[in-house]
């Protein structure tokens, strides 16, 4: 029997009573000391939940009357008050009692975090830890193996484990993404130490693999055959590859390049988008010098961490046999441009030259020639250049012509070459007076005046200097009346050889000049250098005789 | 492994047009990247190469012969063909069909050869 | 067309000894164009070795290649009695041409 504190006269003993009983369950009694049987108090029960119980009025007796449910309700506190009914009075003062509810095993594990998602990297060994799962059991843990929980593995063999008392998931076996990506796992936990009688829980967990890059790139064929067309400009697509890659995203992305290629005449450029090959012309092919190629390709990874090059070993490589393609090429002539000489005035028909253009191709195809720039040549189907005039240098040094040969076989194909013709000199020109002397000599002239310096130009071209001679002719008697004296520096001098000349006896001199170049062979041409006496007045000035000469051919008369 | 197979008429009048076939067992002609070819080889002198054809129709002839050459394919049968056109006594030969390597235009596989004799 | 030039023309040895035949070619060619074959009487030609030093399947090591540019050469290190036949190289760079052959016989 229980005494509370205050020493008061209330005795019971400790209240405890088994949860979810569905028959009433009497608990004990409440009994006052005062209570001397003679059926004059009366008990009565105060308190939250107080409801849930009963109590016999006369003899205390405490039952619970509802089933009660230690998960929700553990504890009740009441209050206990004992009334004599013959004062109506309460005997003793209120007591706080308490009533234990007894755990049982009635609730099973529960999972509370679900759903539960876990990734792991494939390959990952054996003991890597994946996910904690934990399950809670209501039941009273301080009460026998209620809620003591293991845990097990029902479905997940043989890849992973899961410790019994911790709930932690481990891989137990290595897996392959490219084989399975995920697992649904199944966890099971059991109470009571998984001992009879056992209520359980189960969750499912759903473990992805995520992608380690433990796959190389592979090749889709061993072989490829690709061709190019000669005309193909270097930087040209000609094609592509292809390889496949067993992992996903940036495991995936590879770089194709070239492993052998003698003629370094291709190239391989990535398109990271399609993740393809892109074959390239590096250098342009030519079908005549060599039409078949061979070269070796390989492919790698972009990103390979050093503890995955294991994978990696020895890059995937493929063969490309490249073909070329013949295209019908152009004449080529073999000079870019022909420059020929022909000394001016031969006859018609000299050859000049001979240009020639072959077919770079396999057939080798004839040619036929035609030439535009000038009337003045023809060419025939050997590429000979001939005059179809006599060439004067004097009237064009130079002739700029085009020649184009065409095939016979293919008209289409038409190539040009420019023809530079250079006319040679030869001396074929006398040298004579440079310009057209209008000369005057004063009628009171003094001896060894200088009348007139005269020059003279040559329409040949000279290697040298061109050099003049001047000599006055000797058939010429009747001009004693001047003198020339040659200058040495291509001009000369003519000068008054008398004291005095009269306008209305002898107005005018007809001087005969003859002037030589220095050509071999020399020329020599006459030339005559007319001479009009001038009223000059007294100063001798023959400033105005032109004036005076135009007025005298006009009719007029000077003073 | 690639067997290859020549059959075709022995004896062929002049100027008349000289036809064999080539017959591919252990291996599809169809095959990406593989050329077949005729070769013939003159009694007691060395080899010339008459053309090649790809499975999709491309073919490519030596340019002496070029005028005078068909070379066919036929899928289906896994088979190719040659005719030359306008024979002489002079295109008498050992005639070999022949397909070239995984490496390189080298020629990888050869058919054991058949004997074609012009005369009238 | 690029023209090849085998030299010897007839090769006489005791089985044995080292064979080296030369093969030439009118102009440069890649070593990567070259290949090597070996024809029985009767029989068609057997591809020995391309590229121009690897070796075809089922070709023994006493068969080697090597070259570049216009001179190639084809060694059999020690001669066994059927290799006395004749050789042919062949390029395959420029279409495809074979030289003349060199017969290798018994001396």
């Known amino acids: 029997d229980y005494k509370d504190d205050d020493d008061k006269a209330w005795v019971w003993r400790p209240f405890v009573v088994l949860e979810e009983m569905d028959d009433i369950q009497c608990v004990g009694k409440l009994r006052s000391d005062l209570d001397n049987g003679n059926n004059s108090f009366q008990y009565k029960l105060l308190g939250i939940g107080a409801g849930s119980f009963s109590i016999n009025e006369r003899t205390g007796e405490i039952c619970a009357i509802q089933k009660l449910d230690r998960e929700e309700k553990s504890l009740y506190i009441l209050r206990a008050q004992v009334i004599d009914t013959t004062i109506g009075k309460a005997v003793e003062t209120e007591s706080e009692f308490v009533i234990r509810v007894l755990d049982i095993n009635d609730n099973e594990p529960k999972f509370l975090d679900e759903p539960y998602e876990a990734i792991v990297p494939e390959m990952s060994p054996e003991g890597t830890l994946v996910i904690q799962v934990t399950a809670s059991d209501a039941d009273d843990p301080s009460s026998g193996n209620n809620a003591r929980l293991l845990y097990s593995l029902l479905q997940g063999q043989p890849y992973f484990s899961v410790e019994p008392t911790t709930g932690v998931i481990r891989i137990s076996s290595k897996m392959d993404r490219e084989l399975q990506d995920e697992y649904w796992v199944i966890i099971q936990a059991k109470d009571m130490i998984g001992q009879p009688g056992a209520l359980s829980g189960t969750t499912s967990v759903l473990i992805k693999l995520s992608d380690v890059n433990d796959n190389k790139p592979i090749f889709k064929e061993s072989l490829y055959r690709l061709t190019v067309s000669e005309s193909a400009p270097t930087g040209t697509s000609i094609g592509t590859i292809m390889a496949y890659d067993n992992d996903i995203g940036e495991n995936a992305e590879m770089d194709y390049s070239i492993e052998e290629d003698d003629s370094q005449t291709f190239d391989i450029i990535t398109n990271h988008e399609t993740q393809e090959g892109i074959v390239i012309l590096k250098k342009k092919v030519d079908f005549e010098h060599q039409n078949h190629y061979g070269i070796r390709a390989k492919v790698k990874n972009h990103h390979v961490p050093e503890q995955l090059m294991k994978y990696h070993t020895e890059a995937s490589t493929t063969f490309i046999k490249i073909q070329v393609e013949d295209v019908d090429e152009p004449p080529v002539f073999l000079l870019p441009y022909y420059i020929l000489e022909i000394p001016e005035g031969k006859p018609y028909g000299t050859i000049v030259g001979t240009v020639s253009a072959t077919d770079p191709d396999r057939r080798q195809s004839p040619m036929r020639y035609y030439l535009t720039g000038s009337k003045m040549f023809d060419i025939n189907d050997n590429g000979t250049i001939i005059t179809t005039n006599m060439l004067d240098r004097e009237v064009s040094a130079w002739y700029n012509l085009t020649v184009t040969a065409t095939e016979t076989y293919n008209v289409q194909q038409i190539s040009s070459a420019h023809v530079y013709v250079q006319v040679f000199n030869i001396n074929d020109n006398a040298p004579e007076f440079s310009q057209f002397y209008e000369t005057y000599v004063c009628e009171n002239a003094e001896s060894g005046e200088i009348v007139q310096i005269i020059s003279a130009i040559d329409r040949d071209e000279s290697i040298e200097d061109h050099h003049f001679y001047f000599n006055h002719s000797l058939e010429d008697t009747n001009n004693s009346s001047f003198m020339l004296t040659d200058n040495q520096d291509n001009t000369a001098v003519i000068l008054s050889n008398r004291t005095g000349f009269n306008l209305k006896e002898e107005p005018v001199f007809y001087m005969i000049i003859l002037i030589a170049d220095n050509g071999i062979p020399s020329l020599t041409s006459t030339n005559t250098l007319t001479i009009q006496v001038c009223d000059c007045g007294d100063s001798r000035n023959t400033e105005t005789c032109a004036n005076k000469g135009l007025l005298f051919i006009m009719g007029f008369r000077t003073e | 492994q690639v067997q290859l197979q020549e059959s075709g008429p022995g004896l062929v009048k002049p100027s008349q047009t000289l036809s064999l076939t080539c017959t591919v067992s252990?291996?599809?002609?169809?095959?990406?990247?593989?050329?077949w070819s005729w070769i013939r080889q003159h009694p007691g002198k060395g080899l010339e190469w008459i053309g090649y054809?790809?499975?999709?129709?491309?073919?490519y002839y030596n340019p002496s012969l070029k005028s005078r050459v068909t070379i066919s394919v036929d899928t289906s049968k896994n088979q190719f063909s040659l005719k030359l056109s306008s024979v002489t006594a002079a295109d008498t030969a050992v005639y070999y069909c022949?397909?070239?390597?995984?490496?390189?235009?080298?020629?990888?596989?050869w058919g054991q050869g058949t004997l074609v004799t012009v005369s009238s | 067309e690029i023209v090849l030039t085998q030299s010897p023309g007839t090769l006489s040895l005791s089985p044995g000894e080292r064979a080296t035949l030369s093969c030439r070619a009118s102009?440069?060619?890649?070593?990567?164009?070259l290949a090597w074959y070996q024809q029985k009487p009767g029989q068609a030609p057997r591809l020995l070795i391309y590229?121009?030093?690897s070796r075809a399947t089922g070709i023994p090591d006493r068969f080697s290649g090597s070259g570049s540019g216009t001179d190639f050469t084809l060694t059999i290190s020690r001669l066994e009695p059927e290799d006395f036949t004749v050789y042919y190289c062949?390029?395959?760079?420029?279409?495809?041409?074979f030289g003349p052959g060199t017969k290798v016989d018994i001396k």
């Open positions: 252990g291996g599809s002609i169809s095959s990406s990247g593989y050329y």
């Open positions: 022949a397909r070239d390597g995984s490496s390189g235009w080298y020629f990888q596989y």
């Open positions: 062949q390029q395959y760079g420029s279409s495809f041409t």
């Open positions: 590229g121009p030093s």
């Open positions: 054809i790809y499975y999709t129709g491309s073919a």
């Open positions: 102009r440069n060619i890649s070593s990567s164009y």
